[in-house]
């Protein structure tokens, strides 16, 4: 599972008086010579880039996705990759690069013009010309040419949750991403079984907010698993 | 002008807790990894703990862990560090900063102070036996 994969994660040798070790969502950190990594006693020196192990996009780097290292990997196991530049494959935006967007499977420019007329156009063609709304958000968005100077406000159209203001993230609604509002305590959030099953909503909901997680609510433990109700709850 | 004020500080007896509080002004910090670093007397700054921009990814020193929690509210621009069983070697002057969200991640990444571009001017923890 991902969880073991980074317990056993450990950073043996940061120049002193810092060290680190890969955790999720928690790590211990400790000052001592070399990098030991699981499957194998071999250690390596703090120059070679570190795999970041993420549970998604936003936990990497701008330049990052995150993702199973190998093809048709084991799906719990996801680390931060380098992003796909232009003309190369990709499956959803944040594959692709700052500056691009992934259109038909291809990292594509996203220059301002052209990104707001095929989000738009996207959109459009997938609802018809029905502008009615469905959970408070509106089905046809178009990406404001402000949204590289400021950040997205609630329902903007957004790559990364960068892109959006404090207290939203982005999350896929429909076939497009938006800005949302992140999870306050007692709303209801989504506890994915599996790493990378996120991957399947098309209403993707938020992260719970500061000092919540996502648990399952006390008078649903005797619900079945699959009806099991989870909200957001002070840690 | 980018400021991080800290706060909490105090002095407290072996086994008790503090809350540490960073404030952030002049500018968001939503993208930026938060952390806190400490110093004691005559010896060199170390790293304490840090918190990711997505909220949802900390890192700790061996000697902290499951002693230190460290969050974050993006809304209020501020980061927080709850230390409890608190101990003798835990007195330091203890800083607060922000590293900018990187293009490529790792943990290294956390706990190197050179990726710090904003710092407080420290708050101080005294913890006696």
């Known amino acids: 599972t991902l969880n073991s994969v980074l317990n056993s994660n450990a950073i043996k040798n940061l120049p002193p008086p810092l060290g680190g070790a890969a955790g999720h969502p928690g790590s211990a950190v400790s000052a001592a010579p070399g990098i030991l990594y699981p499957g194998g006693n071999k250690y390596q020196t703090i120059d070679n880039y570190q795999p970041y192990p993420c549970a998604e996009d936003e936990e990497c780097g701008t330049d990052e996705y995150c993702a199973s290292p190998t093809r048709g990997g084991d799906a719990g196991v996801q680390i931060c990759l380098a992003c796909r530049k232009r003309r190369k494959r990709c499956m959803r935006h944040a594959m692709c690069c700052p500056g691009n967007y992934c259109k038909n499977g291809i990292c594509v420019s996203s220059d301002q013009n052209h990104f707001r007329g095929e989000i738009e156009e996207t959109i459009t063609e997938s609802f018809g010309n029905d502008h009615s709304t469905l959970d408070g958000y509106s089905r046809r968005t178009t990406l404001s040419s402000k949204m590289y100077h400021t950040k997205g406000q609630e329902g903007s159209v957004c790559l990364r949750s960068s892109d959006c203001a404090s207290g939203l993230c982005c999350a896929r609604h429909f076939w497009s991403k938006i800005c949302k509002p992140v999870l306050k305590e007692g709303q209801v959030c989504t506890k994915h079984r599996r790493k990378g099953s996120h991957g399947l909503e098309i209403f993707q909901r938020c992260y719970c907010g500061e000092g919540l997680s996502c648990r399952i609510q006390k008078d649903h433990h005797q619900a079945s698993n699959s009806s099991r109700l989870h909200t957001c709850q002070r840690h | 002008e980018v400021q991080l004020v800290e706060s909490g500080g105090g002095s407290v007896q072996a086994g008790g807790s503090l809350r540490l509080s960073c404030t952030a002004s002049?500018?968001?910090?939503?993208?930026?990894?938060m952390a806190w670093f400490r110093q004691a007397p005559g010896k060199e700054r170390e790293f304490v703990a840090a918190?990711?921009?997505?909220?949802?990814?900390?890192h700790y020193a061996n000697s902290v862990e499951g002693r230190f929690t460290i969050s974050r509210d993006n809304a209020k621009n501020t980061a927080f560090m709850q230390m409890s069983s608190l101990k003798p070697e835990d007195t330091a002057v203890y800083y607060c900063?922000?590293?900018?969200?990187?293009?490529?991640?790792?943990?290294?990444?956390?706990?190197?102070?050179?990726?710090?571009?904003?710092w407080g001017q420290g708050t101080q923890v005294t913890v006696s036996s």
């Open positions: 002049g500018r968001p910090f939503d993208n930026y990894a």
């Open positions: 918190i990711s921009w997505s909220l949802s990814r900390t």
């Open positions: 900063a922000a590293a900018p969200r990187p293009k490529r991640v790792s943990v290294q990444y956390f706990v190197t102070s050179s990726n710090y571009d904003y």
